[in-house]
């Protein structure tokens, strides 16, 4: 997946207490056991800094070299730094390790802006505040990279969450969490809660404050308030989910359906903001523009460019709209929406202007690439990937960002015909492409 | 064309409150194209950015001067004013009005800026 | 907050002499940065905007160019009535709001 734009986030101290969850209703279908209830050790095992990703402790090798993994759903390998780097405080050391496989193959993942390249290696992998187990996994032993390490990101590696189908060098390289599934009895599924701060944090804030829970193998109630609702996963390779309807303040965009998807609608919780097509970028921009327009903001703003300061604590949200995207259902001719407020599409910037000033990114872009769900989605919601049942869960998130007029919401169903055509078919002959990095 | 014409007294007392007019001539103040701002140049000194204003009164200010400073907007005289209250002899300056063009980015058009002077 | 530092402070060469002002800005600010020119007892008059777009009807000897931390305004060939002051400000943080110290440029 892709930096700079492609990189979240922000984290941090979430809208609500930790401690202090909402009651979450119970009119929800039953579960096979096992794959609900608490599962305290992974609750708040995410840390992360704004618009520098999220990220989980794991160790590799034997005796264990702890390292910070950035959690990356819009991406498939397994891959950590393995050698000296400018941005890297820690790196893992194959010839310490006495669990170390060379695959003897090379690796080379080339993104719209930056790369990395390494050398394929299996070892063996836990996450100290995860399930109780350990895998042998495929590890992408990062030798060279450019544009890839943040400095002052804290993270060391990527852990891709996707299907094997957009893995590299190819798809017989199996991912990560495939190898867990296979090698122990974690249910098929992981969950996440990333818990935007609402403002920025310094990086001792950052590693104090909780960023958010990976809960694998299960969902957690106290994560999240009212219902889970399910959207399919159209295919196995990204988290490929389809977007029916689009409103802005309640206000439909009135485009085909085709446009919102055009050429897939992602979700990806290493891309910072929500990315949408051209043409859905242009009419949602004027529409956002149109409801806000008792004040102004510059072209660049619009870009994402620009930053827009006011006064401490006078932030204007209530000249923003909400923003509301409907995802087909788990039903025939059914769909729910999932609605975010300007508390996640407006992205704290630090150290811009004074301590006296909040200052904020404009945190909705174009793609070319398709519709990206990335962080100002997710920070709004607890998404369950239920890779088991081929669908994903959204609630409203017990941390995100809100005021006391409007918060997210995850509501439905509503009946919406046809959603089928929503989906774009990418043609054969394009897909090679495409997958060699994500304007 | 458009013109931009300050107009206030030249000398206030210490404490008191400064007020200054800016008076747009040759275009509607209320074209959404526009902010509108104040900046100041203390004598020998360099450009301090007040603060700027919509048609609508959506008003931005500099923080250092926060507290202290009003900017309005009067659409029906096609004029905006200034008001800087407690002034002491550090807000003695030159004070220009300018609009905010370039799409709300850069001062493209200035007053000729009026001298206040604070001093009992 | 973001800091512009202007250099030098005096600049002092004779007409049709190439002029190099530099802006340097403490932290990024793309390439939102715009020039002005002061002359006594006149309002600042804008030069350049974007960093490197001249404004309406100001002459093709003045250019601007940098983006991130770094910026130029070059006079390629100082006119008689170029000998003023110069001040930077940047708009990446919105809205605009610091201004450089300024760089003037007199006759030697």
């Known amino acids: 997946t892709q930096h700079g734009i492609r990189l979240p986030l922000r984290s941090g101290l979430g809208g609500a207490p930790l401690g202090l969850r909402l009651p979450r209703e119970t009119d929800e279908e039953p579960e096979e056991p096992g794959r609900r209830g608490s599962f305290v050790e992974m609750v708040d095992n995410l840390r992360g800094k704004s618009g520098q990703g999220y990220y989980v402790e794991m160790t590799v090798g034997s005796p264990p070299q702890t390292l910070n993994i950035l959690v990356d759903t819009g991406s498939s390998n397994f891959a950590v730094g393995a050698a000296p780097h400018p941005f890297l405080h820690r790196y893992y050391q194959r010839q310490l390790s006495s669990t170390y496989r060379d695959l003897r193959k090379g690796v080379y993942v080339p993104y719209t802006q930056g790369k990395w390249e390494g050398e394929l290696g299996t070892d063996l992998v836990s996450i100290p505040h995860g399930p109780n187990v350990t895998v042998r996994a495929n590890i992408a032993a990062i030798t060279e990279s450019d544009k890839f390490f943040i400095n002052g990101s804290n993270w060391e590696g990527i852990l891709g969450l996707a299907y094997a189908e957009i893995a590299r060098p190819d798809d017989s390289l199996e991912p990560f969490f495939d190898s867990l599934v296979k090698q122990t009895h974690v249910p098929n599924l992981f969950s996440l809660q990333l818990c935007g701060a609402g403002f920025p944090l310094n990086q001792s804030e950052v590693l104090a404050s909780v960023g958010g829970s990976m809960i694998i193998g299960g969902i957690d109630h106290s994560l999240y308030t009212g219902s889970l609702w399910y959207t399919p996963i159209r295919r196995e390779w990204y988290y490929e989910v389809i977007i029916v309807r689009v409103e802005i303040n309640g206000q439909d965009l009135k485009m085909d359906c085709k446009e919102y998807n055009y050429d897939k609608s992602i979700v990806d919780s290493g891309t910072t903001n929500l990315r949408l097509p051209k043409k859905v970028f242009e009419a949602a921009v004027k529409s956002i523009k149109a409801a806000s327009s008792t004040e102004k903001f510059p072209d660049g703003f619009w870009l994402g460019e620009q930053l827009v300061c006011w006064q401490a604590g006078t932030t204007p949200w209530n000249i923003f709209p909400v923003i509301s995207l409907y995802l087909m259902g788990e039903v025939t001719n059914q769909s729910f929406r999932i609605t975010i407020l300007p508390q996640q599409y407006l992205r704290p910037v630090e150290d811009v202007a004074t301590s006296q000033d909040d200052c904020y990114k404009f945190a909705i872009s174009q793609s070319s690439t398709g519709t990206v769900m990335g962080a100002v989605i997710m920070e709004g919601f607890y998404v369950v990937f239920d890779r088991a049942r081929k669908r994903i869960g959204f609630a409203v998130s017990a941390c995100h960002v809100h005021d006391e007029f409007r918060t997210a919401a995850v509501e439905g169903p509503f009946v919406t015909l046809d959603m089928e055509d929503c989906g774009y078919n990418i043609p054969q002959t394009d897909e090679s492409t495409l997958m060699t990095g994500r304007a | 064309q458009l013109q931009l014409q300050e107009s206030g007294p030249g000398l206030v007392k210490p404490s008191e409150t400064l007020s200054l007019t800016c008076t747009v001539s040759g275009g509607p103040i209320s074209s959404s194209s526009y902010y509108w701002g104040w900046i100041r140049q203390p004598p020998g000194k360099g450009l301090e950015w007040i603060g700027n204003?919509?048609?609508?009164?959506?008003?931005y200010y500099n923080p250092s001067l926060r507290g202290r400073v009003t900017i309005s907007v009067d659409t029906s005289k096609n004029q905006f004013s200034l008001k800087l209250s407690s002034v002491t002899a550090a807000d003695t300056a030159v004070y220009y009005c300018a609009r905010l063009g370039h799409g709300y980015n850069y001062f493209d058009l200035w007053g000729r800026g009026t001298l206040v002077t604070v001093s009992s | 907050e973001i800091v512009l530092t202007q250099s030098p402070a005096t600049l002092s060469l004779s007409p049709g002499e190439r002029a190099t002002l530099s802006c340097r800005a403490s932290?990024?600010?793309?390439?939102?940065l715009a020039w002005f020119q002061q002359k006594p007892g006149q309002a600042p008059r804008l030069l350049i905007y974007?960093?490197?777009n001249r404004a309406t009807g100001i002459p093709a000897r003045f250019s601007g160019s940098g983006s991130g931390t770094d910026f130029t305004l070059t006079i390629s060939s100082l006119e008689p009535e170029d000998f003023a002051v110069y001040y930077c400000q940047q708009v990446y943080v919105w809205p605009p709001r610091t201004f450089g110290g300024g760089t003037k440029v007199e006759i030697k």
């Open positions: 932290q990024s600010v793309s390439s939102y």
């Open positions: 204003i919509y048609y609508s009164g959506s008003t």
């Open positions: 974007d960093a490197s």
